[in-house]
Interface confidence: medium
């Protein structure tokens, strides 16, 4: 692998000897987190004893990415603390490759293989120690560090237990073959969080799936709380750089959240793409179709490159509660292409939700069942009832005149009116299905500016007189 590696480097000065001096392994054990002098070095066993390295425990390697500041950033210290809190006996090793990372981004990229080789050599040496198992090793790499972890997993003798890629870097890695980036072959389990994947400009995070499971919170692009206004509170100094940092680094904070908020785990759902997820189609947990995120992600028997999605809050704890809503809109006359704005409020045994918008991803299908995704920040408990509101839109005089003429010719029904008999709801987190019916079966119509109430009428989705799942009453 080393010969292969040398061939891939731009210049000889970037080779393994240079990397040896530029890569340091800082051991942070829970027993002595304040001991700053615990640096591991291949061939030197004394620091392992001095710093209470636990050979049989889990060992985490945290690998930072490219840096313009030349310093270890704040997220790293938070991640170290969170790991130590969650896994009290574990060894936490910070891979400090700042001298090589504090370069032009492209030059830092060219150093990732050699840094990965350094990590692999450290692991190979540790494997010679009694009780140490590569299966207990978990490499956690952020941005460029995710690819360093991939190279380490590729070069090590044996198979690392797990690699977590926290928004692996995109530029110079997007679309390249598996030996030149993080890939599922690099560990027994490779899970990835993608938080900055953009289709315009330059995507700082890699867009393509690179692990066994690839999780795209909020579609992997716009992270709540990271808009220009959110980042600094004022547009004047809210720069794109701050937005980039916020969204790119969100992957780290989601991982930290999964460590510290064990009682509020977030779940992601398998889906072919972000648009289908936004439609609420993908909230199934059958056949390993849902999984915890971050530290709580479980290795599944699925093949590789499983794309998963979830929504999150703007800050910790990030967990939200996902609901799929199925609504059949009946239309008794041709109303043309309408783009109604619907809102729902969910009422549960614990709380009621805020007013939630039903996002229309494509177009409302009339005389068809439409699926929506809604999510709440609070745990509502068992759902009891739903209020559906059709927002009244401002109308032109021409629209009003047309509606008035229509009323004269057919006074019993306004032109823009839909009928809804029930709403079917599925909770992503509990997988419970519920059906909500209108209180009065005679009063099912709704027009702009009006609301309809639906009450829980059964557990499950099939009504007594339904003979097949495809029949819509």
């Amino acid at each position: 692998a080393e010969e292969q590696l040398e061939g891939g480097l731009r210049t000889a000065k970037d080779g393994p000897a240079a990397a040896k001096a530029a890569v340091r392994f800082h051991l942070r054990t829970s027993k002595g987190p304040e001991r700053e002098g615990c640096y591991l070095s291949v061939g030197h066993s004394q620091p392992l004893e001095d710093c209470s390295f636990n050979m049989t425990a889990k060992t985490f390697f945290i690998i930072h990415g490219w840096t313009m500041s030349g310093m270890l950033e704040n997220w790293l210290h938070k991640l170290v603390s969170a790991l130590q809190m969650r896994e009290k006996d574990a060894n936490v090793v910070v891979v400090d490759w700042l001298p090589l990372a504090h370069q032009l981004y492209t030059d830092a990229v060219n150093s990732t293989r050699v840094v990965g080789l350094s990590v692999a050599k450290m692991l190979d040496w540790l494997q010679g120690k009694d009780g140490f198992s590569l299966g207990n090793v978990h490499l956690i790499g952020y941005s460029l560090g995710a690819h360093v972890a991939g190279f380490a997993g590729n070069f090590v003798k044996g198979t690392v237990g797990r690699i977590t890629g926290l928004d692996p870097a995109g530029p110079m890695f997007e679309g390249v073959d598996i030996h030149r980036r993080l890939s599922p072959d690099d560990a027994d389990f490779v899970d990835v969080l993608h938080t900055y994947t953009r289709s315009f400009g330059i995507s700082i995070g890699i867009q393509m799936p690179v692990g066994h499971i690839d999780i795209y919170p909020n579609g992997g692009d716009f992270q709540p709380g990271c808009g220009l206004n959110d980042v600094l509170g004022s547009i004047a100094y809210g720069t794109i750089a701050e937005v980039v940092k916020c969204e790119h680094e969100r992957a780290v904070h989601l991982f930290v959240d999964s460590l510290v908020n064990q009682d509020k785990p977030s779940f992601a759902f398998q889906c072919t793409d972000s648009n289908r997820f936004k439609k609420g189609i993908c909230l199934s947990c059958r056949k390993n179709r849902c999984n915890g995120i971050g530290y709580n992600a479980k290795k599944t028997r699925n093949k590789r490159n499983t794309k998963m999605y979830l929504k999150t809050r703007a800050g910790m704890p990030f967990r939200v509660y996902h609901y799929q809503m199925k609504i059949h809109f009946f239309s008794y006359k041709s109303v043309g292409a309408i783009e109604p704005t619907f809102y729902v409020t969910l009422y549960g045994t614990n709380a009621e939700s805020q007013v939630l918008s039903l996002e229309i991803v494509e177009q409302i299908g009339l005389n068809a069942t439409n699926t929506f995704l809604v999510y709440t920040e609070e745990d509502l408990g068992d759902l009891l009832k739903i209020k559906l509101t059709w927002e009244g839109t401002s109308r032109s005089w021409y629209d009003l005149w047309r509606e008035f003429r229509s009323y004269l010719s057919q006074p019993h029904r306004p032109e823009r009116e839909l009928s809804i008999r029930r709403i079917r709801v599925k909770s992503g987190e509990t997988q419970r299905r519920l059906t909500f019916c209108v209180e009065d079966p005679e009063k099912t119509s709704i027009a702009p500016g009006q609301e309809l109430w639906f009450y829980k009428c059964r557990d499950g989705w099939r009504m007594k007189n339904e003979t097949s799942p495809t029949v819509e009453l």
Partner: antibody, heavy 119, light 107 residues
């Protein structure tokens, strides 16, 4: 909006030194690298080096390592370039420009400072 | 150092023409290629970054393409204000290097 305001033209004698300034406004000064670029009359552009105010990190083009010295004053949001032991070869327009991370491009440029070295 | 070559140092075209300016790198630069416009008064502006991404405020008649070592800038419908000198620059590795420039003038 982002602006880089450069100091005025300089006429200097051979062997002397000159200090050019580039004052930044409209963004968080410590978050972006400032680069310096040289353009001799009617010729192309040459990259001199960068200064990153966030950590006082400096990188030079080997060719200019003994010619240019980059410094900054964070309080006035200004980056300086001192050119020493001037010769007629140093007569040129010098631009400062702001680096865009990841894309390695120079998105915003100063108006340039003309340095003329003449006895 | 990576050499950047703009083979055409001067180019004449008519208003409304489609103009293409090319740039070649001495080695693969992985799409880290940027285009700049220097106006007659000396003002320098970024047009295209990372081979094909349009910088904010740049008219859509400008476009970029290429990969590996060969890159080009296209102006689809030449306007009077486009009369300037165009430089390519590689941001792949230090030192950053620029092409010699292509001076665009009206026929």
């Amino acid at each position: 909006q982002v602006q880089l305001q450069q100091s005025g033209a300089e006429l200097v004698k051979p062997g002397a030194s000159v200090r050019l300034s580039c004052k930044a406004s409209g963004y968080t000064f410590t978050k972006y690298t400032i680069h310096w670029v040289k353009q001799r009359s009617g010729q192309g552009l040459e990259w001199i080096g960068w200064f990153y105010p966030g950590s006082d990190s400096i990188k030079y083009n080997e060719k200019f390592k003994d010619k240019a010295t980059l410094t900054a004053d964070k309080s006035s949001r200004t980056v300086y370039m001192e050119l020493s032991r001037l010769t007629s070869e140093d007569s040129a327009v010098y631009f400062c420009a702001r680096h865009e991370e990841y894309t390695n491009s120079l998105a915003y440029w100063g108006q340039g400072t003309l340095v003329t070295v003449s006895a | 150092d990576i050499q950047m070559t703009q083979t055409t140092s001067s180019l004449s075209a008519s208003l409304g023409d489609r103009v293409t300016i090319s740039c070649r790198a001495s080695q693969d630069i992985s799409n880290y290629l940027n285009w700049y416009q220097q106006q007659p008064d000396g003002t320098v502006k970024l047009l295209i970054y990372y081979t094909s991404r349009l910088h904010s405020g740049v008219p859509s008649r400008f476009s970029g393409s290429g990969s590996g070592t060969d890159y080009s800038l296209t102006i689809s419908n030449l306007e009077q204000e486009d009369i300037a000198t165009y430089f390519c620059q590689q941001g792949y590795t230090l030192p950053w290097t620029f092409g010699g420039g292509t001076n665009l003038e009206i026929k």
